[in-house]
């Protein structure tokens, strides 16, 4: 069977006026997954995102991540889109005073 991923979005200060947002998917099986950042519902081009390898996490499941840099103040326009085993979900960037959130998808 399949195990849905835990999805966790974090933000960190990059340069003045910019932040780096990172979307991590973990504890999923099988290893095939789509993880991408979207602006206004449209997938960003590949060269504006950085991807981690899909790696085993030691529990028979896998983990990966994707990051991009965005302008501070435009967080609400960006979402992390995840697709795995026919299921999909979107995950917002947390507000500045809350540094992460995560969801497990069934």
């Amino acid at each position: 069977g399949s195990v849905p991923p835990m999805v966790n979005v974090t933000r960190s200060e990059a340069s003045e006026g910019n932040i780096t947002v990172t979307c991590r998917a973990s504890s999923f099986y099988p290893r095939n997954i789509t993880l991408t950042w979207r602006q206004d519902g449209v997938s960003l081009s590949h060269d504006t995102q950085q991807w981690g390898d899909v790696l085993p996490d030691g529990n028979g499941t896998y983990q990966t991540w994707v990051a991009t840099r965005i302008c501070q103040g435009e967080e609400q326009r960006f979402t992390c889109y995840m697709e795995h085993s026919g299921n999909h979900s979107t995950h917002p960037v947390p507000s500045g005073n809350s540094h992460h959130h995560h969801h497990h998808h069934h």
Partner: antibody, heavy 119, light 108 residues
Framework: DVHLVESGGGLVQPGGSRKLSCAAS????????MNWVRQAPEKGLEWVAY????????YYADTVKGRFTISRDNPKNTLFLQMTSLRSEDTAMYYC????????????WGQGTLVTVSA | QIVLTQSPAFKSSSLGERVTMTCTAS???????LHWYQQKPGSSPKLWIY???NLASGVPARFSGSGSGTSYSLTISTMEAEDAATYYC?????????FGSGTKVEIK
Amino acid sequence: DVHLVESGGGLVQPGGSRKLSCAASGFTFNTFGMNWVRQAPEKGLEWVAYINSGSNTIYYADTVKGRFTISRDNPKNTLFLQMTSLRSEDTAMYYCTRWEPVTGGFSYWGQGTLVTVSA
Amino acid sequence: QIVLTQSPAFKSSSLGERVTMTCTASSSISSSYLHWYQQKPGSSPKLWIYTTSNLASGVPARFSGSGSGTSYSLTISTMEAEDAATYYCHQHHRSPFTFGSGTKVEIK
């Protein structure tokens, strides 16, 4: 009020080129994604191309990929569509559209400019 | 690419009638990335329903939208003369973005 005004349409010979422009006003142009959508006479809508606010994400319909180029000049509030190797099937009304922030969708449309490809 | 199939292609309705049209996607899409447009002859299209079920500004409450996965619909609860138009669904779940071929609604 948001205004989108297309120009540059007209009669073009097959194999020819044409550059369409869209003058935008009434909103902060450099923060919005933009698109071109076309409609052949008595036919349905066909999306042509998308460009995001920073010009670093661009997508094209398969029917125009390699022949059309979407671009924008943010300081001049203008969107462009460079069309080359034009074919009869490119004959259509070309609409400039503004992409809705957050939710997506073509929230504003111009009145269109007609491109006719014919010998 | 994701193909959107609209049915019926043509609908003739009486005033006051309930009208439903469907949009079927060739593969599953997120309801966040499905929108509807209304177009009247000689005019530019207008965003009518966004993200499957939200009415655009100025759209009468007799319109509604619903759906998920591969099946979406637009419903007019009581047809009025001003609703005669062509309605298109549109997806941006995956590039290339696509439109359905449209449902033309006319007054009987």
